[in-house]
Interface confidence: low
């Protein structure tokens, strides 16, 4: 499996999509896990509804949500309020019994928010500071939004 990179902005919601063959994975629940080390285990973060027919219902574990379009063959994971510690290697999985097939390997990278400017016209980026903790990061997004979610701050 090649690794697909998804770059999200700190404080925003990042949506990760994992396409799959809907017939091949018919009836299978899905999961999102975080790879622990290059050859380590993949630690489960969140999985779809226990009843496969209800896989379209969004399930949350903390700030991570999962939903599955079983007809279209697309698993969608949402990482809300993305933080630097969310960066890393993940997998989308298709579950069958105690086994899991990897649908996609995903590398999540966290960028700074260009609209979080401390000085007018001055952008702050990862290269300018030791860590994200130096800056105030407001909610912002460049992705599809969740229903009812208002991730952007009002303009001042």
């Amino acid at each position: 499996h090649n690794t697909t990179v998804f770059q999200g902005v700190a404080g925003q919601s990042l949506q990760v999509s994992c396409p799959y063959d809907s017939m091949k994975h018919w009836g299978r629940r899905k999961a999102w896990c975080r790879q622990l080390g290059e050859k380590g285990p993949c630690q489960r973060v969140v999985s779809t509804h226990n009843l496969w027919l209800l896989s379209f219902l969004r399930r949350w574990n903390g700030s991570t949500a999962i939903t599955d379009d079983t007809l279209g063959g697309t698993l969608t994971i949402t990482l809300r309020n993305l933080q630097p510690h969310d960066a890393g290697l993940y997998q989308c999985q298709s579950l069958h019994g105690s086994e899991a097939d990897t649908l996609r390997k995903v590398l999540v990278e966290v960028l700074a928010d260009p609209l979080d400017h401390r000085d007018a016209g001055d952008l702050w980026f990862p290269g300018e500071s030791e860590s994200f903790e130096d800056a105030h990061v407001e909610h912002s997004i460049s992705r599809s939004l969740l229903e009812g979610e208002i991730p952007f701050p009002p303009t001042s």
Epitope: F6, G8, F125, P126, S142, P153
Partner: antibody, heavy 120, light 108 residues
């Protein structure tokens, strides 16, 4: 399909202002950043700034600070870029561009470009 | 401001040949923050690569990106007739986002 359609070519005198529009369609307008990039004839690409169509907040390249204003109209899914105090070196094709899902600071959907000529 | 220098300025090759384009940054750019574009005359640029090595949607696998630090490379494994164009690199680690001056890939 997803597309950005820009306004037509403009000819302006030095010292004047120009306002270029960029109408988005085929996607949720408020969910993606829009950038502006320009290209002088026979030259390379130059990033001008970024606007968040949801809140309207902006950030501009220092070079254009004080001369450029980016705004949006959510009712028509249109972004505007106004450049004032025009000089001959502002003659260029001006592009609006949307960021893709995978990375918010690169540009995968571009407008067709608007040629702005500054000449006395 | 990060300055990106592309070389060579012009690359003369035949269809089927391998093209190697270079982009050098004036200061270190994390590999996560470099992109490549293709531009044909009279057209807007087209995103090829982001994150130094991730192909954008719909980009053929003959295009690949690599590199880190200050040196980055775009490789076209086997040139097709439609690949003859100008190629730009772009950094987005620091404001302002900047582009290289471009490399023109022309038919030999």
């Amino acid at each position: 399909q997803v597309q950005l359609v820009q306004s037509g070519a403009e000819v302006k005198k030095p010292g004047a202002s120009v306002k270029v529009s960029c109408k988005a369609s085929g996607y949720t307008f408020t969910s993606y950043y829009i950038h502006w990039v320009r290209q002088a004839p026979g030259q390379g690409l130059e990033w001008m700034g970024i606007i968040n169509p949801s809140g309207g907040s902006t950030s501009y390249a220092q070079k254009f600070q004080g001369r450029v204003t980016m705004t949006r109209d959510t009712s028509t899914s249109t972004v505007y870029m106004e450049l004032s105090s025009l000089r001959s070196e502002d003659t260029a094709v001006y592009y609006c561009a949307r960021a893709p899902q995978e990375s918010p600071y690169v540009f995968d959907i571009w407008g067709q470009g608007t040629m702005v000529t500054v000449s006395s | 401001e990060i300055v990106l220098t592309q070389s060579p300025g012009t690359l003369s090759l035949s269809p089927g040949e391998r093209a190697t384009l270079s982009c050098r940054a004036s200061q270190s750019v994390s590999s996560s923050y470099l992109a490549w574009y293709q531009q044909k005359p009279g057209q807007a640029p087209r995103l090829l690569i982001y994150g130094a090595s991730s192909r954008a949607t719909g980009i053929p696998d003959r295009f690949s990106g690599s590199g880190s630090g200050t040196d980055f490379t775009l490789t076209i494994s086997r040139l097709e007739p439609e690949d003859f164009a100008v190629y730009y690199c772009q950094q987005y680690v620091n404001s302002p986002f900047t582009f290289g001056g471009g490399t023109k890939v022309e038919i030999k």
